[in-house]
Each structure stands twice: as C-alpha cells, then as structure tokens.
C-alpha cells in the first residue's frame, strides 16, 4: 500500500501536485492513479459540465516529505 501523497516539484516551477511519485492526476476521474493505469479516452460521465481532456498531470521530480509521514499534504509550495 502506498504511503501518503507528496508534493512534487515540476521542471519549470515549484508547483505541487497531489500525487505520490509514479502516480498521475487523472483528469477524468479526478484523483491520483498509477501513471501506467491511465485508461483509454472515453466520454466524461453524465453530470459533468464539460468534456475533460484525457490527459494527466505528470509528476516530474520527487520532493520527499518526512520519512514515515502518512498524512495528506498541506501544499508547501504555494
């Protein structure tokens, strides 16, 4: 089981993302998933306001939090 989410540093700017390393934010289901498990494009579910692009926020360089920490993050790079 994965530990808690970590703030991750992008290449261009110190923008945190919610996902642990090796996970991507899936813009369809709106939560973190294993990057290799991103599914093929399909229509956004009923009730959605607009079509979501079938892409993901990609983690770049990990910025590890404290060892053993399992808490959901407070974004520290705002």
């Amino acid at each position: 089981m994965r530990r808690g989410p970590r703030s991750l540093r992008g290449r261009d700017a110190p923008a945190p993302t919610p996902c642990v390393p090796a996970e991507c934010f899936d813009l369809l289901v709106r939560h973190c998933v294993a990057c290799g498990l991103l599914r093929t494009p399909r229509p956004k579910p009923a009730g959605a306001s607009s079509p979501a692009p079938r892409t993901a926020l990609q983690p770049q360089e990990s910025v590890g939090a404290g060892a053993g920490e399992a808490a959901l993050p407070l974004p520290g790079l705002l």
Partner: antibody, heavy 118, light 107 residues
Framework: QVTLKESGPGILKPSQTLSLTCSFS??????????VGWIRQPSGKGLEWLAH???????YYNSSLKSHLTISKDTSRNQVFLKITSVDTADTATYYC???FGYGLDYWGQGTTLTVSS | DIQMTQTTSSLSASLGDRVTISCSAS??????LNWYQQKPDGTVKLLIY???SLHSGVPSRFSGSGSGTDYSLTISSLEPEDIATYYC?????????FGGGTKLEIK
C-alpha cells in the same frame, strides 16, 4: 493549517434560491489537483455529495440535482460558492464544504444549517 | 453510480473493545476508499484515506483494510471519544458516493 467555513442564509421559503459560501484558508485553489466541493446531510440522515469544482474550473454535479445547482469559485478570495434554485422542504439540511487533493475529500468545514419552511 | 453499503447502521460496544465497521461497494473501487468520523456535534473528520493510510493526527488505534468491493475500519480499543457515526466514501469514480453510516454507541 487547512480550514473551511460555510455560510448561508439559515432560513429560506420554498421556491427561493439558496446561496452558500465556503471560505477557506491554508491552501490555494490555484494549485494543480486541488478541488472544493459541497456535501449535504438532512437531519438524522446520511451524506450526499452535491457538486465539486477544481483548480482548472472543471465542475461536476450530482446528476439528480444538476438542473438546480451552480458551483463557482473566486480563487483570489479563497472562496467557493454554491447556488441551489427553487429550494423545497427536502433541501432542509446541513451543508458542508470540503477540500479534495488527489485522494478524495480530506478536510471539511463545520457545516451550515438550512431550513426551508413556508 | 457506485453504491456504497454499510450494512450495520448502529453498533453497540464496550470501552476497550475491538470494533470493526464494514462497507461494501457495488463494484470494484480499487482501494479508492476513505473513512470519516462524524461527531454528535456534526464535525466531520477524515480518519483513513486510500483504504489504509492514517490521516494526520488520527490515533493509531484506527486502521483500515480491504480491497475490491469490501472494506473495513477497525478501532483496536474503543475509547469514549470514539462515539460517533462512521462513513465510508468512494472516490474511484465520479459521482463520489458515501455509505449510509454506522452509528457507534457505548454499551
């Protein structure tokens, strides 16, 4: 420290429009992956997810209530809003706002109570 | 929509007891499940996220487990402050949904 606080009118008459505000601190809705949503709970009953808005302005609504709901945000003021048109007595409930950041809802407000009565 | 079912709506236990609360999903939710505690005053707090990860500040007597469609929350030794209603929540697919809640009382 992440905090959220809901505010609303307290009492409305049937057919009026409910306007709720969620004011938050400790995070920014401009952060990638961040979202804030609304959940309600009629007295003595369970939780019902109503609507959610994300940093990229994508919105999602409970399909059974979608025609009555509008969610919006003011990122610079750290606020999220929910409007429910044509309220009925069935909309009497405690309304919560809550944050999401990649793994479902994590931090919740204290709730604001709405009574719809003629 | 994914239906979340908590078959036990109320549960009575003694202080110090080990308590397990169950939740089942109408389809596989791949561990995308959280547990919340709602105190009698209405305050809602996250206890466990992603099936088994303990949220910040939550006592270690709380734990979560499960996979596929079946999940559980365990309190290893019941304390007076644990009197509350507990809800499961799936965020595998939109719309996100909740179980009906399990109200925990002291015998």
């Amino acid at each position: 420290q992440v905090t959220l606080k809901e505010s609303g009118p307290g009492i409305l008459k049937p057919s009026q429009t409910l306007s709720l505000t969620c004011s938050f601190s400790g995070f920014s809705l401009s952060t990638s992956g961040m979202g804030v949503g609304w959940i309600r709970q009629p007295s003595g009953k369970g939780l019902e997810w109503l609507a959610h808005i994300w940093w990229d302005d994508d919105k999602y609504y409970n399909s059974s209530l979608k025609s009555h709901l509008t969610i919006s945000k003011d990122t610079s003021r750290n606020q999220v809003f929910l409007k429910i048109t044509s309220v009925d007595t069935a909309d009497t409930a405690t309304y919560y706002c809550a944050r999401s950041f990649g793994y479902g809802l994590d931090y919740w407000g204290q709730g604001t109570t709405l009574t719809v009565s003629s | 929509d994914i239906q979340m079912t908590q078959t036990t709506s109320s549960l009575s236990a003694s202080l110090g007891d080990r308590v397990t609360i169950s939740c089942s999903a109408s389809q596989d939710i791949s561990n995308y499940l959280n547990w919340y505690q709602q105190k009698p005053d209405g305050t809602v707090k996250l206890l466990i996220y992603y099936t088994s990860s303990l949220h910040s500040g939550v006592p270690s007597r709380f734990s979560g487990s499960g996979s596929g469609t079946d999940y559980s929350l365990t309190i290893s030794s019941l304390e007076p402050e644990d009197i509350a209603t507990y809800y499961c929540h799936q965020f595998s697919e939109l719309p996100w949904t909740f179980g009906g809640g399990t109200k925990l009382e002291i015998k």
